[in-house]
């Protein structure tokens, strides 16, 4: 806090307020300010061998103000504290200390972590993620039609990034296997990207099975396409319902 200092007026008679300048209410030639105007703080400033009274609009850094009916004075903060409201309530600690609930600590208490930027003890923040977004349309090489096995993806957002000691974020991407809509592609539909088509609920024929996301698991290989008769398809549908493997991107 910058202190605006009341200049002292040289006067022959102590305790005579007439002619005192700055924030002084009363002053003397030898001692400077003896008392201050309302809302100003009295402080002693050493000049050479003598102490001079000054009136400040706010206490200098490292001091706090205390009010009394006759005088407002500046008092030093605790040794480990740079700025404070009082001796029990520090607002900024000296280098090497961490601020927590108005106190300066060498180390942060359990359950809190040191923020070396603000030099404060802060709560450990764990990752928070949103609900999953809906599955994307089932596609195979960009097509949303045909008889081919494809993939569909869903994502969720990170709402709160974790702090240094916080729990890491769970996966934010999931991909699984599915069967592209069982209908022949129209001429205009060939190669049309899934995201360009309206999202539709899966048809009865669309079977879904979670598979590794090739982006997150480079080693995963594509399963060859198979033509299936109706009996095989029914059998697969039952199996697919029982599978729920999902591979995801971890943040």
């Amino acid at each position: 806090q910058n202190a605006s200092r009341g200049r002292r007026q040289r006067r022959m008679h102590p305790n005579v307020s007439q002619g005192c300048q700055g924030g002084c209410a009363t002053c003397s030639d030898y001692n400077g300010c003896l008392s201050c105007k309302p809302r100003l703080f009295f402080a002693l400033e050493r000049i050479g061998m003598k102490q001079i009274g000054v009136c400040l609009s706010s206490c200098p850094s490292g001091y706090y103000g205390t009010r009394y009916p006759d005088i407002n004075k500046c008092t030093k903060c605790k040794a480990d504290c740079d700025t404070c409201f009082n001796k029990n309530f520090c607002t900024k600690c000296k280098s090497g200390f961490y601020l927590h609930l108005g106190k300066c600590l060498d180390n942060c208490p359990e359950g809190l972590e040191a923020n070396n930027h603000t030099m404060e003890c802060v709560s450990i923040v764990h990752c928070e993620v949103s609900e999953w977004n809906p599955w994307s349309p089932c596609t195979k090489k960009g097509k949303t039609c045909g008889f081919k096995r494809g993939t569909e993806t869903r994502v969720r957002e990170i709402i709160q990034h974790p702090s240094a000691k916080g729990n890491l974020c769970p996966p934010t991407n999931e991909t699984r296997k599915c069967t592209v809509q069982r209908k022949k592609c129209q001429k205009g539909e060939r190669g049309k990207k899934g995201r360009e088509r309206k999202r539709k609920k899966p048809n009865k024929g669309e079977s879904k099975e979670a598979i590794p996301d090739s982006k997150s698991l480079e080693s995963s290989k594509e399963i060859p396409e198979q033509r299936e008769n109706k009996q095989q398809q029914k059998k697969r549908k039952v199996q697919d319902k029982q599978k729920s493997v999902s591979v995801s991107t971890v943040h």
Epitope: Q1, S57, T66, R67, K87, T91, K92, L101, G102
Partner: antibody
């Protein structure tokens, strides 16, 4: 004389943010810390935090720490308090006050915030 | 946090009588010989107004019928004699520790 004039009433939806201002006059803006206190309807007073106008240092009640930000503009002698991720429980009158030697001696007129869907 | 318990929650006093409100802190609010306890008055639709600072000092411009006393954990606000304009809610507040806290308030009414 010292005067603190706050911005007008606000109505917000849950999840939104609000920024309340407090313009000071009648004294040197950087001389005293600014504090923010709130009062829910029919309830008592609750301290939110403070800012030193001289250097912008701020500190918050742990209860609000992850949702509140206090700033100031020395050129206009204005202090600001922003509260994010609002919920219905944040419906209250928000006051700014100057802090002089461990007490709140001047207060703004209050800003009513209503959080409702 | 320092919890401040005010009593009574409400008080009905006749004009000209004495009103006494107490505030009990969950731990001492004294340090280095100073008591970091303040009292405020709040009327409906208005911000609080400082009455007493440092437990017993009267804020300038406040009538002398208001007085404060106490130290450590027990503090008292006295209004004597009560006047019609004193109808309000009164709060104690400690500045000794982070976070700063207020009492729940005492509502003063006239009998």
């Amino acid at each position: 004389q010292v005067q603190l004039v706050q911005s007008g009433a606000e109505v917000k939806k849950p999840g939104a943010s609000v920024k309340v201002s407090c313009k000071a006059s009648g004294y040197t803006f950087t001389s005293y810390t600014f504090h923010w206190v709130r009062q829910a309807p029919g309830q008592g007073l609750e301290w939110i935090g403070y800012i030193y106008p001289s250097n912008g240092d701020s500190g918050y009640n742990q209860k609000f720490k992850n949702r509140v930000t206090m700033t100031r503009d020395t050129s206009t002698s204005t202090a600001y308090m922003e509260l994010s991720r609002l919920r219905s429980e944040d419906t209250a009158v928000y006051y700014c006050a100057t802090y002089f030697a461990n007490n709140f001696d001047y207060w703004g007129q209050g800003t009513t915030l209503t959080v409702s869907s | 946090d320092i919890v401040l318990t005010q009593s009574p929650a409400s008080l009905a006093v006749s004009l000209g009588q004495r009103a006494t409100i107490t505030c009990k802190a969950s731990q001492s609010v004294d340090y280095d010989g100073d008591s970091y306890m303040n009292w405020y008055q709040q009327k409906p639709g208005q911000p609080p107004k400082l009455l007493i600072y440092a437990a017993s000092n009267l804020e300038s411009g406040i009538p002398a019928r208001f007085s404060g006393s106490g130290s450590g954990t027990d503090f008292t606000l006295t209004i004597n004699p009560v006047e019609a304009e004193d109808v309000a809610t009164y709060y104690c507040q400690q500045s000794n520790e982070d976070p700063l806290t207020f009492g729940a308030g005492t509502k003063l009414e006239l009998k």
